[in-house]
Amino acid sequence: EQKLISEEDLAAKKVVLGKKGDTVELTCNASQKKNTQFHWKNSNQIKILGIQGLFLTKGPSKLSDRADSRKSLWDQGCFSMIIKNLKIEDSDTYICEVENKKEEVELLVFGLTANSDTHLLEGQSLTLTLESPPGSSPSVKCRSPGGKNIQGGRTISVPQLERQDSGTWTCTVSQDQKTVEFKIDIVVLAFQKASSTVYKKEGEQVEFSFPLAFTLEKLTGSGELWWQAERASSSKSWITFDLKNKEVSVKRVTQDPKLQMGKKLPLHLTLPQALPQYAGSGNLTLALEAKTGKLHQEVNLVVMRATQFQENLTCEVWGPTSPKLTLSLKLENKGATVSKQAKAVWVLNPEAGMWQCLLSDSGQVLLESNIKVVPTWPTPVQP
């Protein structure tokens, strides 16, 4: 025969936070470490599960197919209730009745989801929405992989995603001094570098590489490289290509220059030789299937030429160089040097020997070209 449970038998209510889709274990312990009768009910007094004899029985609640108990722990006086595949509507006060005592546990289930696809282009915005039970007033704090902290309530917005935002975001939901942690994987679709510059001597082969800052199982799309040569009045499409399951196939390529493109990732292009007429800047765009917008990478080509014509030794560079770069001509193992923050330097009547043309940035050599000046013998005067 069961005794009535008085108010003083009602233990203080515990608060447990759960995550949508996860499993939670609500504990209930008897004072005696032995198997005894227990029941779990919801706030409407509907039985969820309990013990009858030695068997677990389930009541008519909505949880019946998702609720369970650890039978192996019953003889230790532990009568927990496990709820699988949590739903927001599972948030409720659950009552465990054991040994004429009632233990109340308030379960609050939260869900945190990205409003859109978690694969977003650089510059696009990310919105995280918190699902929470009625009557709760949680706060959310998210930390990006790069260490950026963002706080919010029901929604958290990141207006412009950057490359370094790719990775696992850790979001902490707090309610009643309790916390639950969510991890959301965000992939920012971008090239590893926004811009790169290739420095080459005239005639050398040029390599352009466009590594992606992400990996996808299936990568499909199309791309194009537009080129604005310094000497040209308008830009020109150098190559268009398709990408299907990470395989690159060239659709159309300009005849001058005759580019080669690799068929495997990372996207890779080679130019047979660096020439002044190719110096300039390009923009490679990649449109991915089922994504709005395009990925961009800028690439610059700087070409150097050292020439000797009659009594003039000249060194020139073409392409996008910053005004702080220094161009110098110096004679090897000698002090003779001429330097300018310009795109051309020259020496009249240069001494014989090996001359070096150097393009430098604050002392760091970006590009060098050697040219040998042979001694010029005076022409004998005709009688």
């Epitope: 299907k244 399951n245 395989e247 690799g262």
Partner: antibody, heavy 119, light 107 residues
């Protein structure tokens, strides 16, 4: 076990046609890139034609462009090479070859089939 | 098309020798290069892929190196079964191209 078995070679007159087949088994034919490679008697290897696994795109060496057609029948796991306007210089042993999953070289080859173009 | 220049075209060596074969591409091809061995009347066999990766089942005396335009196949200690013809193949892009081959003969 991966197997590639070529057939369809033989003697053909200049200007004639021939269709080579390569029956494949032991791997996922539909997603693998495949190629035909030939070797003229006493000469080196020459890549002839290829078909992409991912998009079915076809590619040819300049020496056969416009005359040869590569194709595949996924339901039959078979690769084909349709050879038209054959010339004496097309005489060779033709091999069918399977590319590695990530397009790094040909890891499996057939035993080859001899095509002789002669009058 | 990318041209592949292989050297030497023939080579005489003895069992136990260290042998090196080189291949040069007319364009930068990253590491998209394979090495093949062919014996008379047989189909070629892949030895090295991606310039330096040893194909499964191939003895470790075979090694590959290089990147960009210059590549090398090295056999550290020649065995009797290694006398064959060796080819490089660029698979950077289509049309693929083979080197002319190097015939390795017994001295």
């Amino acid at each position: 076990e991966v197997q590639l078995l070529e057939s369809g070679g033989g003697l053909v007159q200049p200007g004639g046609s021939l269709r080579l087949s390569c029956a494949a088994s032991g791997f996922t034919f539909s997603t693998n890139a495949m190629s035909w490679v030939r070797q003229a008697p006493g000469k080196g290897l020459e890549w002839v034609s290829g078909i992409s696994g991912s998009n079915g795109n076809t590619y040819y060496a300049d020496s056969v462009k416009g005359r040869f057609i590569i194709s595949r029948d996924i339901s039959k796991n078979t690769l084909y090479l349709e050879m038209n306007s054959l010339r004496a210089e097309d005489t060779a042993v033709y091999y069918c070859a399977k590319e590695r999953d990530n397009w790094n070289g040909f890891d499996y080859w057939g035993q080859g089939t001899l095509v002789t173009v002669s009058s | 098309a990318i041209q592949m220049t292989q050297s030497p075209s023939s080579l005489s060596a003895s069992v136990g020798d260290r042998v090196t074969i080189t291949c040069r591409a007319s364009h930068v091809i990253r590491n998209d290069l394979g090495w093949y061995q062919q014996k008379p009347g047989k189909a070629p066999k892949l030895l090295i892929y991606a310039a330096s990766s040893l194909q499964s089942g191939v003895p470790s005396r075979f090694s590959g190196s290089g990147s960009g335009t210059d590549f090398t196949l090295t056999i550290s200690s020649l065995q009797p079964e290694d006398f064959a013809t060796y080819y490089c193949l660029q698979d950077y892009n289509y049309p693929y191209t083979f080197g002319q081959g190097t015939k390795l003969e017994i001295k």
